[in-house]
Interface confidence: low
């Protein structure tokens, strides 16, 4: 008899979850020496007993600490760039700046990145049908309790100058329900960070606009104010621009604004 | 063993410069970040300039930024300190040092620079 | 700047007698992330390049007797020798390596009396 099945609204676990993240440890503690001492398997058996046999709707912190004790990084707390809705752009900015750290740029982030998963309650099954959705189904889902975890950590980590890369072309340029508006920007250290640098996105071509005055950075501005830490802006009105002054900062068209 | 030899110190007049070396041996040198820590006479240690590796991290403490250069040549197995505008401030026992867990294991014996007129 | 501030500047201690030297941080050197701190402490004997004795706070370094030790947390660190012995006649000091610019502490001058 077939058994009874809990249907998520959410897509359902990554397919071959157990051998990517397995491969993405491997490939990622050949590439970091300083992460070389990293025991994969046991990295695996550690985020596999986050979410196996429990109940993907009642998933804690505390469930993930085993798998953050074996993933403990050192990441230079003053070259964090953090992001709201604009991963991509932030990749390939921290691909380019070598010595800035991504959370996705970490062991544990690099796992995840882009995966999902869930487990059911009292079985050692993995759910590849759905996983629940964080707005229909619950907010203490497996997926949605690792990032809010290690992306506390990440921020509770950073000092001195924090950077963030916002997404100019959305409606809601800081997003308070984000993880960066809801996890991170609370968790930064006001006795250890100085500043936090909006770096704002844009995305038309024509668009000479200065978002650093949208209301949302202005929002952002006061929550960061409050919490006794500095506050910048920068419009980044040209990010392929942006990205190959980077590359090449001696470029001569790299003196103007970008 | 882990050898550090540095070079290139000696008496220089105010607004003058000088080349530090130091020749590294003993150990992967492409694979460490390299220190330079300064010692003024009868004074503490002051950390001077740092660069990674693979020369891709740089970082300088204030009072030399804009002054000093680190630079290194993987090839040669040697780290360079190029000093510009010497001020008498910076008369000192330079000393280079490999990086370890983001501090220093191994230093060299240091090499004097005297900036006077 | 952070600043470091070792205290006292100098001591004289009998031979087999214990050593306390502190260090204070202007700022928190626990990087919460991996739970460690981010202080090392040196030892310059005279006409002589320094010489690492702890990082982590409390790692001894590979060589160095154990009479050395290191401790602390957060702001405040210690450097204690368990019995001093005619060759630790040198100045300690402590750095910070949280972040750049690195800080070292002033320097204190053990002696014997």
């Known amino acids: 008899v077939p058994r009874w099945r809990q249907q998520w609204s959410g897509p359902g676990t990554t397919k071959r979850f157990p051998e990517t993240v397995l491969a993405r440890c491997v490939k990622y503690t050949e590439i970091h020496p300083e992460m070389r001492h990293v025991d994969c398997q046991s990295v695996w058996d550690a985020f596999k007993g986050a979410f196996i046999s429990k109940h993907p709707c009642n998933i804690t912190e505390e469930d993930y600490q085993p798998l953050m004790k074996l993933g403990t990084q050192t990441v230079p707390c003053n070259k964090i760039l953090l992001w709201s809705r604009i991963k991509d752009l932030a990749h390939q900015f921290t691909q380019v700046q070598r010595d800035m750290f991504t959370l996705e740029d970490t062991l544990l982030g690099y796992l995840a990145d882009d995966l999902t998963w869930c487990g059911e309650f009292n079985t050692s099954k993995i759910n590849y049908q759905s996983c629940p959705d964080w707005r229909k189904d619950c907010s203490n889902n497996p997926v949605s309790v690792f990032w809010k975890t290690v992306s506390r950590r990440f921020a509770e980590a950073a000092c001195d100058v924090v950077h963030v890369m916002l997404n100019g072309s959305r409606s809601k340029i800081f997003d308070k329900n984000s993880t960066f508006g809801s996890v991170e920007v609370h968790n930064l250290q006001p006795e250890k960070v100085q500043t936090l640098e909006a770096w704002v996105i844009h995305g038309g071509r024509e668009d000479s606009r200065d978002l650093c005055q949208d209301p949302t950075i202005k929002e952002l501005e006061s929550i960061i104010s409050k919490r006794n830490i500095q506050f910048s802006c920068k419009n980044i009105y040209r990010p392929d621009k942006f990205l190959q002054c980077v590359k090449n900062p001696e470029d001569s068209s790299c003196t103007s604004e970008i | 063993e882990v050898q550090l030899v540095e070079s290139g110190g000696g008496l220089v007049q105010p607004g003058g410069s000088l080349r530090l070396s130091c020749a590294a041996s003993?150990?992967?040198?492409?694979?460490?970040?390299m220190h330079w820590v300064r010692q003024a006479p009868g004074k503490g240690l002051e950390w001077v300039a740092y660069?990674?590796?693979?020369?891709?991290?740089?970082y300088y403490a204030d009072t030399v930024k804009g002054r000093f250069t680190i630079s290194r040549d993987n090839s040669k197995n040697t780290l360079y300190l190029q000093m510009n505008s010497l001020r008498a401030e910076d008369t000192a026992v330079y000393y280079c040092?490999?990086?370890?867990?983001?501090?220093?294991?191994?230093w060299g014996q240091g090499t004097l620079v005297t900036v006077s007129s | 700047d952070i600043v470091m501030t070792q205290s006292p500047s100098s001591l004289a201690v009998s031979l087999g007698e214990r050593v306390t030297i502190t260090c204070k941080s202007s700022?928190?050197?626990?990087?919460?992330?991996?739970?460690?701190?981010?202080l090392a402490w040196f030892q310059q004997k005279p006409g002589q390049s320094p010489k690492l004795l702890i990082y982590?706070?409390?790692t001894r370094e590979s060589g160095v007797p154990d009479r050395f030790s290191g401790s602390g947390s957060g702001t405040d660190f210690t450097l204690t020798i368990s019995s001093l012995q005619a060759e630790d006649v040198a100045v300690y000091y402590c750095?910070?390596?949280?972040?750049?610019?690195?800080?070292f502490g002033q320097g204190t001058k053990v002696e014997i009396k």
């Open positions: 003993g150990f992967t040198f492409s694979s460490f970040g």
């Open positions: 750095q910070r390596y949280y972040n750049y610019p690195y800080t």
């Open positions: 040092a490999k990086s370890h867990d983001y501090t220093m294991d191994y």
């Open positions: 660069i990674g590796g693979d020369s891709n991290i740089i």
């Open positions: 982590w706070a409390s």
């Open positions: 700022q928190s050197l626990l990087y919460s992330t991996n739970q460690k701190n981010y």
